[in-house]
C-alpha cells in the first residue's frame, strides 16, 4: 500500500492548489458564491472546510475541499458550523481562497503542518 504523505508535503500541495486557483481565476470564482467568514486562529483546516463545503457545483474548488478533508480529523458535512464561532459575516469564495492561501503560507513557514 502507498505510504502516507508527510504533513509538510500535503500542506505544500494544498498551497500549490490554492495558487493555481487564484492565478487561473478568470470569471468570478464559483459564480461569486459567498461563504461564512472565520475569526479563528486555530483549527484552520476544519473551519475552512466547514465553510467551503457549503459551496456545491463549483469544480474549481472541489480538489481543495478534498484536500482540506484530509487535514481535518473529524467528518465535516454541509451546514455544520462547530468551528465557526461567528456566523454573521459572509465573504466571497475568491476572497476566502486568497486569505486561506496567505495564511497557509504563513503556517508552512512556521512549520505548522497539522
Amino acid at each position: 500500500s502507498p505510504s502516507p504523505v508527510p504533513p509538510s508535503t500535503a500542506l505544500k500541495e494544498l498551497i500549490e492548489e490554492l495558487v493555481n486557483i487564484t492565478q487561473n481565476q478568470k470569471a468570478p470564482l464559483c459564480n461569486g458564491s459567498m461563504v461564512w467568514s472565520i475569526n479563528l486562529t486555530a483549527g484552520v483546516y476544519c473551519a475552512a472546510l466547514e465553510s467551503l463545503i457549503n459551496v456545491s457545483g463549483c469544480s474549481a474548488i472541489e480538489k481543495t475541499q478534498r484536500m482540506l478533508n484530509g487535514f481535518c480529523p473529524h467528518k465535516v458535512s454541509a451546514g455544520q458550523f462547530s468551528s465557526l464561532r461567528v456566523r454573521d459575516t459572509k465573504i466571497e469564495v475568491a476572497q476566502f481562497v486568497k486569505d486561506l492561501l496567505v495564511h497557509l503560507k504563513k503556517l508552512f513557514r512556521e512549520g505548522q503542518f497539522n
Epitope: 467568514s37 486562529t41 484552520v44 465573504i91
Partner: nanobody
Framework: GVQLLESGGGLVQPGGSLRLSCAAS????????MGWVRQAPGKGLEWVSS????????YYADSVKGRFTISRDNSKNTLYLQMNSLRAEDTAVYYC???????????WGQGTLVTVSS
C-alpha cells in the same frame, strides 16, 4: 469587498491619550498581520506599528516606542492603537492596513485624523 474603517481620531492636548480602532470586514482578518501607518501634513507615509496574526508579536517605530500600544481582537475583527503621551509631532492621518509581504494583499483604510495641539 474588503473594508477597513478607522475611528477614534480627534483633537487632543499634548500629553493626552487617544485610542484608535479599525473595524475590518470582507476578508478573514484573523489570518492577517496588521499595522498602522501615518502621514503628517505635507510629509510622506511613516510606518508606526504592526502586529502578527496571532497578536503575540508587536513592532514599533522608535518614535512611538513606549508610548503607543498596538493590539487586536480577532473575535471582533478589530485592530487598535492606544496612543499615550501624545506630542505635536504625532499629528497625522492614521491609516490601518494589512501588513503582508505577499503582493496583492495590500488593504488600506481611509484614515482618521489625529491632531495634537494646545
Amino acid at each position: 469587498g474588503v473594508q477597513l474603517l478607522e475611528s477614534g481620531g480627534g483633537l487632543v492636548q499634548p500629553g493626552g491619550s487617544l485610542r484608535l480602532s479599525c473595524a475590518a470586514s470582507g476578508f478573514i482578518f484573523a489570518w492577517y498581520d496588521m499595522g498602522w501607518v501615518r502621514q503628517a501634513p505635507g510629509k510622506g507615509l511613516e510606518w508606526v506599528s504592526s502586529i502578527d496574526w496571532k497578536g503575540g508579536k508587536t513592532y514599533y517605530a522608535d518614535s512611538v516606542k513606549g508610548r503607543f500600544t498596538i493590539s487586536r481582537d480577532n473575535s471582533k475583527n478589530t485592530l487598535y492603537l492606544q496612543m499615550n503621551s501624545l506630542r505635536a509631532e504625532d499629528t497625522a492621518v492614521y491609516y490601518c492596513a494589512t501588513a503582508e509581504d505577499e503582493p496583492g494583499y495590500d488593504y488600506w483604510g481611509q484614515g482618521t485624523l489625529v491632531t495634537v495641539s494646545s
